[in-house]
Every structure is written in structure tokens, then in C-alpha cells.
């Protein structure tokens, strides 16, 4: 393997237990995507994570073990962005209304929406239960974390010519080795305490000159607020 066995996400590390209290797991009999709790009753995830029936699992660390801090809440409404494009993954964002309010505590809490777009060079935290191997498959039970910088839009577009829209941005390392991967979709990219990104897509995982591509949450703040207001 190109990286040490203890490299996680790909090239990340085991998050400290419940240190990412806004992280949720979307479950349909198995974990298939991540998400972020933005208020007591709403979760942000990726549009391509849409399913008609979803159980939202909050307070998770080890998704294979009941550790006592979990809250399992079914989705009452699942609202994919109306302009979501499955082929290009443009507008890759979705809102989930929980059937009951989450109990906010030290292990389950919300993350703020962004007040400004992500700035190049800003260090962000990416988390999820996705594949930890860039070659091969190794799905972790425990939540994985990765610290990674926002890349310039020019570098992002150069990495994926013709594929990056204004609703996408890149986070990661052009040298490869560190990235989100399959199973991380929908999960958070948090920079300076704000949810700047949603894990969306990439060409493979952790490949050289192929950084992760993320939905730019800043572009959707108005849609998020309007949708929540219309469905409260």
C-alpha cells in the first residue's frame, strides 16, 4: 500500500470520539453517506445521497457499535436541490428534515452555515466513514478526520478541465495521498467553524493532481434558509 496502514479517510486520522458532533451517518440498512446537522431538525448532505427513506444517525463514532451517545431519527422530508444534475453533480446538495428534534448535547450539536465563501489556503476539517484506502477497500468503523487546505479555483479547474462549476471547489493536496473517498459523500468540510463544503466527488481518491471536489455551501445559504422556512 502506498500509505501506512493507520492512514485513514485516505491519509487522515481517527477523530477523537464525538469531536465532530455535527457529523451524521445516513443509513438505509448500511452506512451510505455522511451529513451535517445545521439545526435541531435539519441536516445538510449531498444531492447524490438522495434516497426515499433514510435513517439519520447522530452522535456516532463507531458505526458498528452502540456506544450510548447515538440518536437514530428517521427522515421526515428529504429535499434535493431542484437543479441537481446527476451526471455532472452540479448543485450536489440536499436537505433532510428529521421526524423529531435532535437532543443537543456535548456529543450532538450543530454547525454554522458560512457567512463568506471559502478562502484559498484556509485549513479545513473533513470527516467521514468512507473508504480509507486509495487502492483497495478498507471501510472503517470509527469516524475518520482529515485536515486539508482549500485550493484555488484555478488549480481546481486545472485538475478537472471543463468539469468544475461555480458551485464546486477543491480541498486537498495535489501531491495526492490525502482525500475523502467512497462513503464520505454528503459529509462536512468545516473551515473556521463554518460548514463550507459537502463531500461530493473526485477522480478516484487521493490521486496525484486529482483533489477532492466539494459543493460550495455558501452558494446555497439562501436556498437552505428558504427551504427550511417553507417546511417548518
Amino acid at each position: 500500500a502506498p500509505f501506512d496502514d493507520d492512514d485513514k479517510i485516505v491519509g487522515g486520522y481517527n477523530c477523537e470520539e464525538n469531536s465532530v458532533p455535527y457529523q451524521v451517518s445516513l443509513n438505509s440498512g448500511y452506512h451510505f453517506c455522511g451529513g451535517s446537522l445545521i439545526n435541531e431538525q435539519w441536516v445538510v448532505s449531498a444531492g447524490h445521497c438522495y434516497k426515499s427513506r433514510i435513517q439519520v444517525r447522530l452522535g456516532e463514532h463507531n458505526i458498528e457499535v452502540l456506544e450510548g451517545n447515538e440518536q437514530f431519527i428517521n427522515a421526515a422530508k428529504i429535499i434535493r436541490h431542484p437543479q441537481y444534475d446527476r451526471k455532472t453533480l452540479n448543485n450536489d446538495i440536499m436537505l433532510i428534515k428529521l421526524s423529531s428534534r435532535a437532543v443537543i448535547n456535548a456529543r450532538v450539536s450543530t454547525i454554522s452555515l458560512p457567512t463568506a465563501p471559502p478562502a484559498t489556503g484556509t485549513k479545513c476539517l473533513i470527516s467521514g466513514w468512507g473508504n480509507t484506502a486509495s487502492s483497495g477497500a478498507d471501510y472503517p468503523d470509527e469516524l475518520q478526520c482529515l485536515d486539508a487546505p482549500v485550493l484555488s479555483q484555478a488549480k481546481c479547474e486545472a485538475s478537472y478541465p471543463g468539469k468544475i462549476t461555480s458551485n464546486m471547489f477543491c480541498v486537498g493536496f495535489l501531491e495526492g495521498g490525502k482525500d475523502s473517498c467512497q462513503g464520505d459523500s454528503g459529509g462536512p468540510v468545516v473551515c473556521n467553524g463554518q460548514l463550507q463544503g459537502v463531500v461530493s466527488w473526485g477522480d478516484g481518491c487521493a490521486q496525484k493532481n486529482k483533489p477532492g471536489v466539494y459543493t460550495k455551501v455558501y452558494n446555497y445559504v439562501k436556498w437552505i434558509k428558504n427551504t427550511i422556512a417553507a417546511n417548518s
Partner: antibody
Framework: QVQLQESGPGLVKPSETLSLTCTVS????????WHWIRQPAGKGLEWIGR???????FYNPSLKSRVTMSVDTSKNQFSLKLSSVTAADTAVYYC????????????????????WGQGTTVTVSS | DIQMTQSPSSLSASVGDRVTITCQAS??????LNWYQQKPGKAPKLLIY???NLETGVPSRFSGSGSGTDFTFTISSLQPEDIATYYC????????FGGGTKVEIK
């Protein structure tokens, strides 16, 4: 224009392992999920499973115990092994690419298949 | 497993006719329903994805609709080159195909 070509032995003996390879030309193997589907003569289509270049696999639950898929990015190929075959495994086997031609979403989801190989006939007989 | 029930299993229609095929899922699959055309001796070809989206290069006489468990595929004006077997396929959870509908010309 991405093209797929299945290859492998056309005849396999009962209880042995069927091995097929799909070669991807005209594009990179790294951006998509890759599938195997089969079709017995005169019957419908059955999905066998899929693989991503990360090595992530999902198999049809009814075939899971007998299926192994692998990928070789250096050769732009992916492969299928089906063990303990019987006459019921006689079929045309297709490889296919999913629709996510702008890179793979990083979810554990499934997608329709927009590019298919021409298919290869495998007969299980002694 | 999600089961896909397609009907009819075969039909015969005249050139210019409107042809309709239905597909029913055993549980809610949202709009994760695709339609394929397979001509004899050939691989299937994707026509419609996500219930109603026409794949690039596919003639506009083909269309799809539906959501949840009930879906419809329509050929607005049957052409001789449309003789084929048509399959629905769900990709909500794993992948399963319907049994197929063989379309013939009267």
C-alpha cells in the same frame, strides 16, 4: 469514445471458476464504477456486481458468496471471478460503465450504465 | 431485494402507434429507475435515466415518467427500428432489472 471489451474462456467446466476480464479503451478507468451483468440465452438481465478503482465492491446478494471482482488500473482492466459454476451460470456476460462520467460521487450509491461491452458467451459444460 | 415487475411481457403494435410499458417496484425507489433497449444479439442501450431524463442521442419519441413505485415508458410513434426488448432497472438499492418487454411490429 470509451469502449469496453470482454475476454475470457468461452467454456468452463462445472465446479470450476469462471474468469473474465474487461478492457477499457478510449478513456481512463479511474473515474467511474464498473459493472458485470449477465444474461442467460432467451432470458432477462441479471446484475452481478460493481467495482470502483478504489477497490470498493458491491455484489448481488444472491451471488455474493461466489463472486470476486478486481481492478488493474495500470492495464485499464477490471475482472470477474465466479466460483463453483454450474450449468445455470451459462450466459452472455457483459461489462459496463456507469453514467457518472464526470468522476464518481463519493457515496455508496448505484448508477445506471451508459456504456456496455458487446458481451461474451460463457458455457458451463463438462 | 427490490423486485421489478414489468408489463406486458410482449406486445405487437403498428408503425406510428403509441406504445406504453409499465414497471412496478416492490418498494419506493424515488426516481431511481432507468430504461434500456436491447436488440437481438446486441448489448443493452440506456435510453432513459432517473425515470424521465433522456440519454444523450436518444430520439425524443422515447419518454419516461413516474416516481415511487409506478413507472411508465412510452414510445410516442413506433418506428421499425424500435423492434427490441425493453428493460426497466432500479438502482436505488443494488441493481435489479425487470423481466423485459418484447416489442414487435404488427
Amino acid at each position: 469514445q470509451v469502449q469496453l471489451q470482454e475476454s475470457g474462456p468461452g467454456l468452463v467446466k462445472p465446479s470450476e471458476t469462471l474468469s473474465l476480464t474487461c478492457t477499457v479503451s478510449g478513456g481512463s478507468i479511474s473515474s467511474n464504477y464498473w459493472h458485470w451483468i449477465r444474461q442467460p440465452a432467451g432470458k432477462g438481465l441479471e446484475w452481478i456486481g460493481r467495482i470502483h478503482t478504489s477497490g470498493s465492491t458491491f455484489y448481488n446478494p444472491s451471488l455474493k458468496s461466489r463472486v470476486t471482482m478486481s481492478v488493474d488500473t495500470s492495464k485499464n482492466q477490471f475482472s470477474l471471478k465466479l466460483s463453483s459454476v454450474t450449468a445455470a451460470d451459462t450466459a452472455v456476460y457483459y461489462c459496463a460503465r456507469d453514467i457518472t462520467n464526470y468522476g464518481s460521487g463519493k457515496s455508496i450509491r448505484f448508477y445506471p450504465m451508459d456504456v456496455w461491452g458487446q458481451g461474451t458467451t460463457v458455457t458451463v459444460s463438462s | 431485494d427490490i423486485q421489478m415487475t414489468q408489463s406486458p411481457s410482449s406486445l405487437s403494435a403498428s408503425v406510428g402507434d403509441r406504445v406504453t410499458i409499465t414497471c412496478q417496484a416492490s418498494q419506493d425507489i424515488s426516481n431511481y429507475l432507468n430504461w434500456y433497449q436491447q436488440k437481438p444479439g446486441k448489448a443493452p442501450k440506456l435510453l432513459i435515466y432517473d425515470a424521465s431524463n433522456l440519454e444523450t442521442g436518444v430520439p425524443s419519441r422515447f419518454s419516461g415518467s413516474g416516481s415511487g413505485t409506478d413507472f411508465t415508458f412510452t414510445i410516442s410513434s413506433l418506428q421499425p427500428e424500435d423492434i427490441a426488448t425493453y428493460y426497466c432497472q432500479q438502482d436505488d438499492t443494488f441493481i435489479t432489472f425487470g423481466g423485459g418487454t418484447k416489442v414487435e411490429i404488427k
